[in-house]
Interface confidence: low
């Protein structure tokens, strides 16, 4: 029973993900005090954000609501080092950020990573000003590093009447302009608990008049053409649906896509049986539904993207976000999303504070970023469908898609398997006819050392993975298997096999 | 292997009321759509209702409207149909089916179907 | 709520040969995913329906190769392409689009 065959419907896709599928965030939060944006001047960060490229990357969080953009604001003496270091640089060709900015920041940062989970677990939040600094911080990392800016703007500044105060955006706008900086929008931060954040009740129908307005601003822009997202909602709990529903009825017309967010656990809370358990996995399903039903009602054929999504909220959960165990809810995350219809997926977040980050501290890699990198590699933007044959079968997960065809390992007409296995035993993956006898290559990751599965370091085939160099990331070697041979999936293991000249026409 | 088993038909007088049940297994329940759909003794497929996965939302057809209610108990894998007030004309094979639109909550078609009830209405 | 038409209502087939049974609906059934919301299922004598084709054109877990869909918006068929005894029965489409769900009158298949 250890043997498990596999069904696949690959007559044509279900869906079609954007090419920047799996994005990335970046938490407002890392503005709070601007210095540390610095770190974003790292060329081993940019490096490691360049592996995951093409991709979003969306500058949001509950900070969004309390970031003030000051134009007239001085950069502090840290920006200032790191600007004059690069003044006879190629922007993207960054020198590193100077050592003695660096040391300094790094040995602030755990207390300034204390003071913003704080904030955030007492629901105390304070006002900040950003300067001109921090937007060309925040814009030449993307830039730099491949990726497409999202940011949020703030839609806790309101009139007396309750109408958003849009002067503020006003003058960032200007500010972009001026600079050329080409980048999408979003307004405001899970709007459904502004109320818990700060005493204030926003409904649907405002909010979506508030998205009209900021629409009619970027039309006047130089970037006519800028994409707006929104409306960034929490879970579809009840009142939460509500809200989408009349936002999406008022001011869904001038939205690109519909944001919502999902957290499976308190990251205060979770325990690695949850990070583990098909229940906590299966809940995502319904969550999705919710909001595709409010939306179809709405706006049918409106593209809804997951604008913020994480294993547990409030930073993550301590030792478990960050480890291997992580990358089970990461991967089932992704392909429900795709299989789902869901166009893209952003991760909270690349780098800052908290569990849940892609790249740790110190700039290293964690394993859901070794994770993310392999699927950026091998996984396709045409969905198709796999299933296990049997019942009961729910810690088993398998995903299918065509291959990447920007891979040039693969040619069109290949198809990338992925897949969970949450049994204590290894299983034995069937493929089903006319696929069985195909050349399969095979990525499995394993962690790596004693922690198991809450280590946070991790094996490809046996090969640990780590970057060569600040500039390099590792070859990703493929194992291949003797064709026809069942594709074994070790307990408490994922991995993607990639089923070579399987010649499917719908890829 | 995946199993739809319905129960609770017979023969009952016009203007009373029967409950008819349709125990699932071998799927999980909980994420799946479930419809009722009659057939008429020598007639066609006729659609009754439907309820979504969670039970938030349920759809029924005119003729059955008001006087029938859909309901399902995701702890007992169980989905109902309470039938009050019927008529002649609700003398059919009562079917469960399983809606496949778990990934899709909006696609309403029967991948799986139970073998029927009977339910006769007559004095 | 969409009426469903479907012709013939009866077809006698010589086994071997080749059948098609057309359906129409009032509206199209086209959704902006890009899918026609189309099932085609096949109640044997004696026995409850089961799903042949859904989705205009995608066939279900089991249903042999002979059996194909096609069609869009609002005029669908239903294609065997080689009849075997064991196809004999009722063929029915239905509209999956909205609700209330709506079937054709049914097509009843023999053998000649």
């Known amino acids: 029973q250890d043997v498990v065959d596999l069904d696949f419907f690959t007559q044509q896709p279900l869906h079609l993900v954007s090419p920047s599928f799996l994005s990335v965030t970046i938490d407002a939060n890392l503005a709070t005090d601007p210095r540390f944006l610095i770190f974003l001047g790292s060329p081993k960060l940019r490096t490691l954000a360049r592996g995951l490229s093409p991709a979003y990357l969306r500058f949001g969080g509950t900070k969004t609501d309390f970031l003030i953009f000051d134009p007239k604001k001085e950069s502090t003496f840290e920006e200032r080092s790191y600007w004059q270091s690069q003044v006879n640089q190629d922007i993207c060709k960054s020198g590193s950020i100077p050592p003695d900015v660096e040391e300094k920041l790094r040995s602030e940062w755990p207390y300034q990573e204390q003071v913003l989970l704080r904030e955030h677990y007492q629901k105390k939040f304070k006002n900040s000003t950003y300067s001109r600094s921090s937007v060309d911080m925040l814009y030449t990392f993307a830039n730099c590093s491949g990726l497409d800016l999202i940011f949020g703007l703030n839609a806790l500044l309101r009139t007396a009447d309750l109408q958003w105060n849009s002067s503020n955006a006003q003058l960032l706008l200007d500010y972009c302009s001026s600079k050329r900086y080409n980048m999408s929008w979003e307004l405001g931060n899970e709007p459904n608990s502004f109320l818990k954040k700060a005493d204030i009740f926003i409904n649907g129908s405002q909010l979506g008049e508030d998205f009209i307005q900021l629409h009619k601003l970027l039309r006047k822009s130089t970037f006519k053409n800028a994409k707006l997202y929104g409306p960034d909602v929490g879970q579809p709990r009840r009142k939460t649906a509500e809200m989408l529903k009349s936002f999406l009825k008022a001011g869904g017309e001038v939205i690109d896509s519909v944001t919502w967010h999902h957290y499976y656990l308190n990251g205060r809370t979770a325990t690695e049986e949850d990070f583990l358990n098909p229940d906590v996995l299966d809940i995502f399903i319904s969550s999705v539904q919710k909001v595709f039903q409010v939306v179809e009602s709405t706006r049918p054929g409106k593209k809804v993207w997951l604008g913020e999504t994480s294993s547990a909220y409030g930073g993550g959960a301590p030792l478990l976000s960050d480890t291997f165990a992580a990358g089970f809810m990461w991967l089932d995350k992704l392909g429900l999303s795709a299989r789902m219809g869901i166009e893209v997926v952003m991760r909270q977040v690349f780098f800052g504070a908290g569990n849940y980050h892609l790249v740790d501290e110190n700039f290293d890699p964690l394993p859901d970023y070794w994770l993310s990198l392999l699927f950026k590699k091998l996984v396709g933007t045409k969905v198709l469908m796999a299933s296990v044959k049997g019942p009961k079968r729910r810690n088993l997960r398998v995903y299918l898609h065509c291959t990447n065809t920007d891979n040039p390992m693969y040619k069109e007409g290949d198809l990338t398997l992925y897949a969970i296995n949450l049994y204590n035993v290894t299983k034995y993956l069937r493929l089903p006819y006319p696929f069985f006898d195909k050349q399969v290559d095979k990525y499995l990751l394993r962690p790596l050392g004693p922690h198991g599965l809450l280590s946070k370091a991790v094996q490809l085939n046996g090969q640990t993975l780590k970057m060569v160099d600040d500039q390099t990331l590792p070859p990703l070697m493929e194992k291949p298997l003797r064709p026809g041979s069942s594709l074994g999936l070790p307990a408490f293991s994922y991995s993607f096999f990639v089923i070579r000249n399987a010649k499917v026409a719908a890829c | 292997q995946v199993q739809l088993v319905e129960s609770g038909g017979g023969v009952v007088q016009p203007g009373r009321s029967l409950r008819l049940s349709c125990a699932a297994s071998g799927f999980t329940f909980s994420s799946y759509g479930m419809h009722w759909v009659r057939q008429a003794p020598g007639k066609g497929l006729e659609w009754v209702a439907v309820i979504w996965y969670d039970g938030s939302n349920k759809y029924y057809a005119d003729s059955v409207k008001g006087r029938f209610t859909i309901s399902r108990d995701n702890s007992k894998n169980t989905l109902n149909l309470q039938m009050n007030s019927l008529r002649a004309e609700d003398t059919a094979v009562y079917y469960c089916?399983?809606?496949?639109?778990?990934?899709?909550?909006?696609?309403?078609?029967?991948?799986?179907w139970g073998q029927g009830t009977t339910v006769t209405v007559s004095s | 709520y969409i009426v469903m038409t479907q012709s013939p209502l009866s077809l006698p087939v010589t086994p071997g040969e080749p059948a098609s049974i057309s359906c129409r609906s009032s509206?199209?059934?086209?959704?902006?995913?890009?899918?026609?919301?189309l099932d085609w299922y096949l109640q044997k004598p004696g026995q409850s329906p089961q799903l042949l084709i859904y989705l205009g054109s995608n066939r279900a877990s089991g249903v042999p190769d002979r059996f194909s869909g096609s069609g869009s918006g609002t005029d669908f068929t239903l294609k065997i392409n080689r009849v075997e005894a064991e196809d004999v029965g009722v063929y029915y489409c239905?509209?999956?689009?909205?609700?209330?769900?709506?079937f054709g009158q049914g097509t009843r298949l023999e053998i000649k």
């Open positions: 239905m509209q999956a689009l909205q609700t209330p769900i709506t």
């Open positions: 089916g399983r809606d496949p639109g778990t990934y899709h909550y909006y696609y309403h078609g029967m991948d799986v």
């Open positions: 509206q199209s059934l086209l959704h902006s995913n890009g899918y026609n919301f």
